[in-house]
């Protein structure tokens, strides 16, 4: 909201850098047959580039990413058969970020 | 992506807590009647509740919020000339979080 001038600190730009975000696992694991009885955990932390740049024509983009496999436990019930799975979900962490022109292709390292 | 079992650590739940997020200061927040201006900074950091809970029927919600006024610069363009003004934007930081039933009304402290 916009107020009259009060004891307000100057706003600092949220610089382009990695921040901790929450990645939802369950949605990506749920199958169309709705066979999932239990998926754990439902979400995990990932590192992602966020923030803004000095110019509207550039965007905060990852310059270095790392794939991190994590183990998810899952019970599916298919035709009365409980299937106990330990599945590996590969998460993508951003390690470094940069303000890049929108047209630039995103590198994957 | 879901893969076969590799050297994967067990996935840890992203618990319900405050995390740093990026809040975009939209021009509409400053002045809805005028389009000929810029806002600086375009985005700031805020603290927000995120993560997931032990149950699908509960959500990670703030139990305590704090309003934080910050000073932004509004650069108006009048007859090709920049006019510098200061405006106050009130940001909302979440100070504490709790997994609450979805129906529960969100308290604002």
């Amino acid at each position: 909201s916009l107020g009259s001038l009060t004891i307000a600190e100057p706003a600092m730009i949220a610089e382009c850098k990695t921040r901790t975000e929450v990645f939802e696992i369950s949605r990506r694991l749920i199958d169309r047959t709705n066979a999932n009885f239990l998926v754990w955990p439902p979400c995990v932390e990932v590192q992602r580039c966020s923030g803004c740049c000095n110019n509207r024509n550039v965007q905060c983009r990852p310059t270095q990413v790392q794939l991190r496999p994590v183990q998810v436990r899952k019970i599916e019930i298919v035709r009365k058969k409980p299937i106990f799975k330990k599945a590996t979900v590969t998460l993508e962490d951003h390690l470094a970020c940069k303000c890049e022109t929108v047209a630039a292709a995103r590198p994957v390292t | 992506s879901l893969g076969s079992l590799t050297i994967a650590e067990p996935a840890m739940i992203a618990e319900c807590k405050t995390r740093t997020e990026v809040f975009e200061i939209s021009r509409r927040l400053i002045d809805r009647t005028n389009a000929n201006f810029l806002v600086w900074p375009p985005c700031v950091e805020v603290q927000r509740c995120s993560g997931c809970c032990n149950n699908r029927n509960v959500q990670c919600r703030p139990t305590q919020v704090q309003l934080r006024p910050v000073q932004v610069r509004k650069i108006e363009i009048v007859r090709k000339k920049p006019i510098f003004k200061k405006a106050t934007v009130t940001l909302e930081d979440h100070l504490a979080c709790k997994c609450e039933t979805v129906a529960a009304a969100r308290p604002v402290t």
């Epitope: 239990l38 754990w40 436990r73 019970i75 409980p82 106990f84 | 032990n54 149950n55 699908r56």
Partner: antibody, heavy 116, light 107 residues
């Protein structure tokens, strides 16, 4: 350490309902299911059904399908099993157990006696 | 439902004896079988999962083997504290089913 603590002994009349609670501690409650198993006096073990502590999904043994309801309350890490239309042959010790592909931790059991 | 049978229904053996219990499933259950020990007035205790995996803290004198329809549970050297009833349980299909149990006591 992992613990499942059940509610106390119940004496019920035929036709009544009973609700047994099972409070879990010492582990991440939502990461497992809770199974309910009963044992009539001097008899073997009989699986009644289970509930996913995270999303409340249930699966009941056909025998109990119409009479049992399993629920979960994650604010207190407690699972409940309600059995309706009690008959004398429902007299048994009712156990809750933490469940994955095995029942690795069990409650102490709740004796339910159905008698007129 | 998958029927589980156990034999013998009861047995008496001396301390130090090797004790073997068999469990048979009415259909192929692969290795989806657990073994439990239950002492009088107590809750069952998981001893072996996945037909042959010994649970943490369970003495090594207990072992399990088998797959498909035929399974074996062995106590290599019976101890006085092993007096209990032993149950097999399948988790291949719902509903999960238990064997009728084998009561073990000491001569």
């Amino acid at each position: 350490q992992v613990q499942l603590v059940q509610s106390g002994t119940e004496v019920k009349k035929p036709g009544a309902s009973v609700k047994v609670s099972c409070k879990a501690s010492g582990y991440t409650y939502g990461a497992y299911a809770i199974s309910w198993v009963r044992q009539a006096p001097g008899q073997g073990l009989e699986w009644m059904g289970w509930i996913s502590a995270y999303n409340g999904n249930t699966n009941y043994a056909q025998k109990f399908q119409d009479r049992v309801t399993m629920t979960t309350d994650t604010s207190t890490n407690t699972a409940y099993m309600e059995l309706r239309g009690l008959k004398s042959d429902d007299t048994a010790v009712y156990f809750c157990a933490r469940a994955w592909n095995s029942f690795d931790y069990w409650g102490q059991g709740t004796l339910v006696t159905v008698s007129s | 439902d998958i029927q589980m049978t156990q034999s013998p229904s009861s047995l008496s053996a001396s301390v130090g004896d090797r004790v073997t219990i068999t469990c048979q499933a009415s259909q192929d259950i692969r290795k989806n079988l657990n073994w439990y020990q239950q002492k009088p007035g107590k809750a069952p205790k998981l001893l072996i999962s996945d037909a042959s995996t010994l649970e943490t803290g369970v003495p090594s004198r207990f072992s399990g083997s088998g797959s498909g329809t035929d399974f074996t549970f062995t106590i290599s050297s019976l101890q006085p504290e092993d007096i209990a009833k032993y149950y097999c349980q399948q988790y291949y299909n719902l509903p999960f089913t238990f064997g009728p149990g084998t009561k073990v006591d000491i001569k």
